[in-house]
């Protein structure tokens, strides 16, 4: 018979033959042959593989480094990685939670809608028209543009979400 060019799900093609993939939690020791099945071995104590695979090495579980404020939220198994979270009152810097911050700052152009608490991080909001923020801050709201009119001045440069308006003297030239 013709050698296969594609294999079924949970199989892989090697040496013109379809071999079974190793199940999650196990790594490949040797490919199948015409006479033998794929040989797989369970991952070690601090290792995992989370897919049907033909990997010859398992992945190391993530280390939740206490020096970065991390602790274990969910212990890894042979099929799942360890999930880290931050110590109480601290917040993950990313979805992968590789480090912790006390709270995040809102970038220029954004103001603080809600200051961080022990359970929720800083909530930022974009500065609407008429308001600006030119700093990175974990407490400052968007500031209103300066009103040139109330100072008997005129707008020389329009404001943006990151900059205040620039006021200047009125043109007093007469025709």
């Amino acid at each position: 018979p013709e050698p296969p060019t594609a294999c079924r799900e949970k199989q892989y093609l090697i040496n013109s033959q379809c071999c079974s993939l190793c199940q999650p939690g196990q790594k490949l020791v040797s490919d199948c042959t015409e006479f033998t099945e794929t040989e797989c071995l369970p991952c070690g104590e601090s290792e995992f593989l989370d897919t049907w695979n033909r990997e010859t090495h398992c992945h190391q579980h993530k280390y939740c480094d206490p020096n970065l404020g991390l602790r274990v939220q969910q212990k890894g198994t042979s099929e799942t990685d360890t999930i880290c979270t931050c110590e109480e009152g601290w917040h993950c810097t990313s979805e992968a939670c590789e480090s912790c911050v006390l709270h995040r700052s809102c970038s220029p152009g954004f103001g603080v809608k809600q200051i961080a608490t022990g359970v929720s991080d800083t909530i930022c909001e974009p500065c609407p028209v008429g308001f600006f923020s030119n700093v990175s801050s974990a407490f400052e709201k968007c500031h209103p543009w300066t009103s040139c009119e109330t100072k008997d001045l005129v707008v020389q440069q329009a404001g943006t979400n990151k900059t205040d308006v620039v006021c200047g003297p009125q043109d007093r030239l007469r025709a």
Epitope: L68, G69, T93, S99, L102, R104, V135
Partner: nanobody, 116 residues
Framework: EVQLLESGGGLVQPGGSLRLSCAAS???????EMWWVRQAPGKGLERVS?????????YYADSVKGRFTISRDDSKNTLYLQMNSLRAEDTAVYYC?????????WGQGTLVTVSS
């Protein structure tokens, strides 16, 4: 990288005053937003006060408004917290923090105990 060292804590009677200092070494605090945060025994972190990089804007938690004053002296690379009319509920370890507020910038804190 910046190291922050808090000092000035101690035992004080209710109604008394203390001035906490936070001295930075290894890097400047100039231009950086700074915070005071506290942790009472068996409680979570509470954000007490903050000051903008320019020193022009400040924030105070409702629980300390009118009693605490935050200030900075960039020439001395030091942040301060003047605490007046102290109450038993102000008892906590006080920490300072500098933007970007990462865990490895965290100081050891200074213990404030308010008791008669």
């Amino acid at each position: 990288e910046v190291q922050l060292l808090e000092s000035g804590g101690g035992l004080v009677q209710p109604g008394g005053s203390l001035r906490l200092s936070c001295a930075a070494s290894g890097s400047t605090i100039a231009g950086y937003e700074m915070w005071w945060v506290r942790q009472a025994p068996g409680k979570g972190l509470e954000r007490v006060s903050a000051i903008s990089g320019s020193g022009g804007s400040t924030y105070y938690a409702d629980s300390v408004k009118g009693r605490f004053t935050i200030s900075r002296d960039d020439s001395k690379n030091t942040l301060y917290l003047q605490m007046n009319s102290l109450r038993a509920e102000d008892t906590a370890v006080y920490y300072c923090a500098r933007d970007p507020y990462s865990f490895d910038y965290w100081g050891q804190g200074t213990l404030v105990t308010v008791s008669s």
